[in-house]
Structures are given as C-alpha cells and as structure tokens.
C-alpha cells in the first residue's frame, strides 16, 4: 500500500489495476469495493464486470481504462474526504483460490487554496518526483499542454493526475521539462 | 441527444489514404464508459466493423483491416478520426461512427448518418 | 468468426401483416445478438439488443427471440414506415459481425 494514491477534494482519483487476458482472449471478471479485499469476492462493490460487459456500477464510479484488454483501473469522479481508504480490485481468475487480489490506499486532501499565478516552465526542481505511477489520466488533465502557462499550484494539485505517457509528451511539447520516474 | 457527424473527402485516389472524421456532441465524450467506433458498409452489401478507440486511447482494430487502420482520439474538439492506408476500390463504402457503451459491449446505440466515400483515379 | 446468415433475404408483405425473419449463427453465440433497421440513405437504428430486449423508443410490435444459433426478428403488425433492411449482428466472439440483411418490401 505504502504511501497510497493522494487526490485532493474534488478532483477525480484513479486507482490502477490491470491483468493479462488469457490465450483464449475471454474477458476476466472482475470486482472493485470499498474496503481490503475479503477472503471471497468484493465487499462494498462499486463495479463489477463479467466477461464481456461492465455490469454494475454507481454513479461516481467508472473504468478508466480499457476492459477489453484488461485495463481495469477504476476512476472514482469528484472525490470527497469520505472516499479516503482501502479499495480492492479483484480479478476473478476461474478455479478455487486464483483470485487475483489489489488493496489499493486512497488519501483524499482538502483542496488548497489557488494563489496568484506563478510563471514556471520548468517543472523539474520543483517537482521532482512526478508522473511517477503508469497508467491513463483523467480527462481533465488531458489538454493540459495546450495551455501557454501553468501556475505551479495546478501542477501540485495535479501531480497525482498526471499518470498518461499522452499527457507526459503534451507537457514536453507546451516547453515544460518533466522527469518521469 | 447524442450526436456524431462524419466528414471528410468523398474521393480517394488508389493507393492514397483515406481520412475521416467523427465530432461528437451531446454526450459525455470526454470520460469512461463509452467506445468510438468506425463500420463501413460497401454499397448494396452488409455492415463491417472496422475498429474503436476508448477514451484511454486504447484501440482495436477488426484483423481483417489491422495492418491499414488506425483510430485517434482528440478530446478537445469531441472528435475521432480513421485512417485507411493503401486503399483499393473495395474500400468504396459509406463510413459510419457509432457508439456502444462498456455496460452493453458492440452494441451500437447511436450512429452518424454515414459519409460515402469512393476510390477511384 | 462467426457468421450470420439471414433469410429469406427479400420478405414481401402488406401492411397490417405479421412479419417474421431470421438470423442463424455458425456457432453460438447465446443471447448475444442484435437487430438493427436501416432506410435508404439512414443509418442503422438499434432495434433489439440481446435477442429479446428493445432498444428505447422502440414499438411494442417489434419482439426479438431466439438463442444458441436460431434468431428471429418478429413484426406483429407491419405499419407503413416498418420496409426497410433489416441486419442482425452478433457480438458474442470478437470481432463483432453481421449479416448480410433481409429487405423488407411492400407487396
């Protein structure tokens, strides 16, 4: 779990959660909940998909990711601090006990408050430990590199958003220097 | 109401590639849940799926057409776009857009009213 | 993959008539099939979506059932604005298919 995935209030949380499709290409069921991960299916369930649709979800709640390869990473929309804590993801392997098993930590902070605009091109010394967890970010955050300038407290908000290899290069193209890793 | 819109040349030249592309409006494009898809129908025949993106970026192309399509996104104009490299005369069809949603996968809910294209010199 | 066979491939019929058409997998594809109709110059609409559930703001007279390999579309009543083609489509295996259409013409 270590430190967990930190989100600020009302900013969307993605949780990333992913498996190898089998040789047959048959979709895995899976489970998200709220809550570690119990011995047998998922408790406080916000998703569940099946081998060949998602067929449950609330209303927050959505895969970030492409299912139908595998990508089952969870997005959690317009977080409050009741979101805080332990998600499970559950791959669903068929036969007794093949489950594949994630407790996932999510910390929700209180959202700061947005000073005057700061111009910062590089990113690098303030930062330097950004994009540091694989997967897709949230949409929001994705034309990000279109903007000609980003105040230092929009990157800090956003840091825990930023996680597409797409949005690295949008960054790289706006003249941002980033390190990933 | 959701509505997607295909565009682009109506004429292709043998060999060339073929670009189109779909703007969505309406509807939630920019977040999970739903997939963009190209079919094509060649005139007088049946439908052929071609490929779809997700909102990820994820792909996936019908094998029949893998090695000459690709599939984009641009969530900031609401839009995908096909391309169809090295195309022939069989590839005259109209081109539709549609969409389908994870909760009911490769059913095609809402479709573009279709853009006839022809490959002739 | 699969392929769908649909017949007859032309159905002639009056309005007020019972229309009935069917759709046959090569292998089975459960209850994973759905009905499209399609207008000259249109788009295909979404009728039925696994084989026996109407999409929203479908009619009443149109009834899909069937499962495994054998589907049929059902019109109880055709209306004047029912001729058109009519596809099923499969989306049991990937990639998702369809068959080759029914036409539905005035007699």
């Known amino acids: 779990l270590e430190d967990g995935y930190k989100v600020e209030v009302g900013k969307n949380a993605y949780l990333p959660c992913s498996y190898t499709l089998p040789t047959s290409g048959t979709l895995v069921p899976v489970c998200w909940g709220k809550g570690a991960c119990p011995v047998f299916e998922c408790g406080n369930v916000v998703l569940r998909t099946d081998e060949r649709d998602v067929n449950y979800w609330t209303s927050r709640y959505w895969l970030n990711g492409d299912f139908r390869k595998g990508d089952v990473s969870l997005t959690i929309e317009n977080v409050t601090l009741a979101d805080s804590g332990i998600y499970c993801c559950r791959i669903q392997i068929p036969g007794i006990m093949n489950d594949e098993k994630f407790n996932l930590k999510l910390v929700i902070k209180p959202a700061k408050v947005t000073p005057a605009p700061t111009r910062q091109r590089d990113f690098t010394a303030a930062f330097p430990r950004m994009l540091t967890t694989r997967g897709h970010g949230p949409a929001e955050t994705q034309t990000l590199g279109s903007l000609p300038d980003i105040n230092l407290t929009q990157i800090s908000t956003l840091a825990n958003e930023l996680r597409d290899s797409r949005l690295a290069n949008d960054l790289r193209d706006s003249g941002a220097t980033i390190r990933i890793g | 109401q959701v509505q997607l819109q295909e565009s682009g040349p109506g004429l292709v030249k043998p060999s060339e590639t073929l670009s189109l592309t779909c703007t969505v409006s309406?509807?939630?494009?920019?977040?999970?849940?739903?997939?963009w898809n190209w079919i094509r129908q060649p005139p007088g025949k049946g439908l052929e799926w071609i490929g779809y993106?997700?909102?990820?970026?994820?792909?996936n192309y019908n094998p029949s057409l893998k090695s000459r399509v690709t599939i984009s996104l641009d969530t900031s104009k609401n839009q995908f776009s096909l391309k169809l490299s090295s195309v022939t005369a069989a590839d005259t069809a109209v081109y539709y857009c549609?969409?389908?949603?994870?909760?009911?996968?490769?059913?095609?809910?809402?479709w573009g009213q279709g853009t006839l294209v022809t490959v002739s010199s | 993959e699969i392929v769908l066979t649909q017949s007859p491939a032309t159905l002639s019929l009056s309005p007020g008539e019972r229309a009935t058409l069917s759709c046959r997998a090569s292998?089975?594809?459960?209850?994973?099939l759905a009905w499209y109709q399609q207008k000259p110059g249109q788009a295909p609409r979404l009728l039925i979506y696994?084989?026996?559930n109407r999409a929203t703001g479908i009619p009443a007279r149109f009834s899909g059932s069937g499962s495994g390999t054998d589907f049929t579309l059902t019109i109880s009543s055709l209306e004047p604005e029912d001729f058109a083609v009519y596809y099923c489509?499969?989306?049991?295996?990937?990639?998702?298919?369809f068959g080759q259409g029914t036409k539905l013409e005035i007699k």
């Open positions: 549609a969409r389908d949603h994870y909760s009911s996968s490769w059913t095609f809910d809402y």
């Open positions: 309406g509807g939630s494009f920019s977040r999970g849940g739903y997939y």
């Open positions: 993106i997700y909102y990820s970026g994820s792909t």
């Open positions: 292998q089975s594809v459960s209850s994973y």
């Open positions: 696994d084989a026996s």
């Open positions: 489509q499969q989306r049991s295996n990937w990639p998702p298919t």
